[in-house]
């Protein structure tokens, strides 16, 4: 039977019709109290004191209303949930994940969690309301959680009419013996010894750091990972593993070339509620490789959109080259990331100015031949985008990466509704297309323009009159990207380019074939 | 550290294939390149591979002639060179490139007799 | 193809003295991405070569403070302030910045 529920966006967290809770209002101390009334959240500030016994983890603050027994926790940094048992930095989950408490909410199959508090999991053994529920990490959210010991992190999904587990997508720290870091690498405690100018790492216990905060000696060191050893360690938090270095006889410090473990192409994917013309309305966090181009123009002030990207590491984006036709200096271009809305800012995006950016020397401006560019983030560090539940990489294909012929695919982008609509999106949309076969994609069907083997065709393949909302890419959505699924990963597999008009029957989109790409890509990105 | 350890010698016969290994341990993730060189002569970069992904670029002279591969879960590039020739025999290094070619593989001679 | 000429072709050296290679591109080295990728290799008699400097003037982990290099374009230099025995072997430049890469002729150092 359907369910009258409320979402309180703040948290995230859902309540039953009638259901009351309490809230922290951010960056205040005052606390809220909520009522849901046919699906809508009703609050109203209320009174409270300190909690008469400790209900929070993690350094969270209780608070607990004067008039009833509810109470509310104010989380540090990096912490939320009812009691801040909620890690929002943890990347990754070590061994099976009995103790992971991060905020992954994606099934193998791409399927999006189902909230562990849900009437719907009542009779299931593991859920919200067991009295355990805080010890297992479940509660009133849908991240993947292993409270039964099974082998990894897990949570319920709905499929074929109803709920079943399924394992998660989550990362795991460490991936058999592989020497790499996640997140900013304060976990990592592998051998790497190298910086990245090739420099040897000096031991923590090396007598020439005396003086120096981060040692052998630090009455932390063991937790910080720190010993009569010379490998790469991040103890304080840093961008990513580094360590103490020689440097023509001065002692200095360097980033290290430990590799990061890729979470590239995971997403938490949530399923789009709003139909536009030309796809569907999108959240950045089931796109976090989606990036947004604005270019500063000589003759007009301010900053407008220009294009699409795709963050393929933490410092490149990938794009198009017809974008950059006008020669913008690199200094007039900057980079958003993590934005939902096109011109609206979002909580928690990264925003960029461009070192430096390559466009395809072949590139063939009437053809699109050759439609690639690179462009690199500025940064004070080796680091430059931040991993997070909204910005993260795609996977770049293998070379040998051959899909099947109408394999379901999808693009992303800030582009126009239509063809001759005179705006684009406001908001991301996200559009579902077929990868058609090379016999399909030639010049004959595409009005005699010149198409090459550097390019791949894909569209809406679904029947319908000349009103069926067909998905496609439009203008504005150049340079962002077209990802299918490969390996549980979401796949670069094209570059969005050209096409005639949007979204018309049997007129694919025309995208630069990455795979082509590959050494091109890795030649540009070289230090 | 990248350690790179190389197969042993190979004694071929002209016109036919060769393929020889490169087992990279520490930091796999950088281009495995292959450089020859005949005795008594100079260096010769013949191409490269990405580990990762597997994409090649290869120089002209070795087009169509050369193949380069890898088996990322045993962390093994592999070079093959096909329509063996006198002239090709040499030593055939594998040499791991971050900024440069940094870390070399020992060498394996290839030797092309009839 | 760029090519890639060392001069001299040998170059014999007494212990404690300075000693300069030169290396010429028949096209500027500048990649696309801004960088140049000059490099200077020593091969030591019966061993695989072994990496000195990197991107023109980068002397890697472990390279003695002796070696430098320079230049820019496409004329580059590699110096020793003052050759040791150890020094001896063949020395190659090389550039990596337009495919196919290429190494120079070499430059055998001996000690007279």
């Known amino acids: 039977s359907y369910q009258v529920i409320c979402r309180d966006e703040k948290t995230q967290m859902i309540y039953q019709q009638h259901q009351s809770w309490l809230r922290p209002v951010l960056r205040s101390n005052r606390v809220e109290y909520c009522w849901c009334n046919s699906g809508r959240a009703q609050c109203h500030s209320v009174p409270v004191k300190s909690c008469s016994e400790p209900r929070c983890f993690n350094g969270g603050t209780c608070q607990q209303a004067l008039y009833f027994s509810d109470f509310v926790c104010q989380c540090p940094e990096g912490f939320a949930g009812k009691c801040c048992e909620i890690d929002t930095r943890a990347t990754c989950y070590e061994d099976q994940g009995i103790s992971y408490r991060g905020t992954w909410s994606t099934a193998e199959s791409g399927a999006e969690c189902t909230n562990w508090n849900s009437s719907a999991l009542a009779q299931k053994p593991y859920s919200g309301r067991r009295p355990d529920a805080i010890r297992l990490g479940l509660g009133n959210h849908n991240y993947c959680r292993n409270p039964d010991r099974d082998s990894k992190p897990w949570c319920y999904v709905f499929k074929a009419g109803k709920y079943s587990s399924e394992f998660c997508s989550t990362p795991a720290c460490s991936e058999g013996n592989s020497d790499c870091y996640f997140g900013n690498g304060s976990a990592y405690r592998g051998t790497h010894s190298l910086t990245e100018s090739g420099a040897s790492c000096l031991p923590w216990n090396s007598m020439i750091l005396i003086g120096k905060v981060y040692t052998a000696q630090n009455p932390s060191a063991q937790a910080l990972g720190l010993g009569k050893h010379n490998y790469c360690r991040n103890p304080d938090g840093d961008a990513k593993p580094w360590c103490h270095v020689l440097k023509n006889r001065r002692l200095t410090w360097e980033y290290c070339d430990v590799p990061s473990c890729s979470t590239c192409g995971l997403r938490q994917y949530s399923q789009p509620q709003f139909r536009i013309k030309g796809g569907l309305f999108a959240d950045i966090a089931s796109h976090p490789w989606q990036a947004a181009i604005f270019a500063k123009h000589r003759r007009s002030p301010g900053e407008r959109f220009l294009c699409g990207g795709i963050l393929i590491s933490s410092c490149w984006i990938l794009s198009a080259a017809h974008c950059f036709q006008e020669r913008f200096p690199p200094h007039h271009l900057t980079v958003i990331l993590g934005r939902t809305y096109r011109v609206v800012p979002g909580e928690e995006e990264q925003k960029f100015e461009v070192e430096k950016y390559i466009v395809h020397k072949e590139f063939d401006d009437d053809t699109y031949d050759n439609d690639i560019a690179l462009l690199q983030l500025k940064s004070d560090s080796s680091r430059c985008a931040q991993e997070s539940s909204v910005v993260r990489t795609v996977c770049l294909p293998p070379a040998d990466l051959q899909l099947p012929d109408w394999t379901e695919c999808e693009l992303s982008g800030y582009g126009k509704h239509e063809a001759l609509s005179p705006f684009y999106s406001e908001r991301l949309k996200e559009a579902h297309v077929r990868l058609y076969p090379s016999s399909r994609c030639t010049s004959q069907h595409l009005l005699n323009r010149t198409v090459t083997d550097n390019m791949l065709c894909a569209g809406d393949t679904r029947s319908g009159g000349p009103q069926a909302n067909l998905h496609d890419a439009c203008q504005g959505d150049s340079g962002g990207p077209l990802v299918c699924l490969n390996d549980g990963r979401m796949t670069l597999v094209g570059i969005i380019s050209w096409g005639l008009g949007c979204g018309q029957k049997d007129v694919p989109g025309v995208y630069t074939k990455v795979t082509n790409y590959l050494d091109w890509i890795r030649d540009n990105m070289r230090p | 550290q990248v350690q790179l350890v190389q197969s042993g010698a190979e004694v071929k016969k002209p016109g036919a294939s060769v393929k020889v290994s490169c087992k990279a341990s520490?930091?796999?993730?950088?281009?495995i390149n292959w450089v020859r060189q005949a005795t008594g002569q100079g260096l010769e970069w013949m191409g490269r591979?990405?580990?990762?992904?597997?994409?090649?670029g290869y120089a002209q002279k070795f087009q169509g002639r050369v193949t380069m591969t890898r088996n990322t879960s045993i962390s093994t590039a592999y070079m093959e060179l096909s329509s063996l020739r006198s002239e090709d025999t040499a030593v055939y290094y594998c040499?791991?490139?971050?900024?440069?070619?940094?870390?070399w593989g020992q060498g394996t001679l290839v030797t092309v007799s009839s | 193809d760029v090519v890639v000429t060392q001069s001299p072709l040998s170059l014999p050296v007494t212990p404690g003295e300075p000693a300069s290679i030169s290396c010429r591109s028949s096209?500027?080295?500048?990649?696309?991405?801004?960088?140049?990728?000059l490099e200077w290799y020593l091969q030591k008699p019966g061993q695989s070569p072994q990496l000195l400097i990197y991107?023109?003037?980068n002397r890697f982990s472990g390279v003695p403070d002796r070696f430098s290099g320079s230049g820019s374009g496409t004329d580059f230099t590699l110096k020793i302030s003052r050759v040791e025995a150890e020094d001896v072997g063949v020395y190659y430049c090389?550039?990596?910045?337009?495919?196919?890469?290429?190494f120079g002729g070499g430059t055998k150092v001996e000690i007279k």
């Open positions: 096209q500027s080295i500048v990649h696309s991405n801004g960088n140049t990728y």
């Open positions: 040499a791991s490139y971050y900024y440069a070619m940094a870390y």
């Open positions: 520490g930091n796999t993730s950088y281009w």
């Open positions: 591979i990405d580990p990762g992904g597997g994409s090649t």
């Open positions: 090389f550039q990596g910045s337009h495919v196919p890469w290429t």
């Open positions: 991107k023109v003037s």
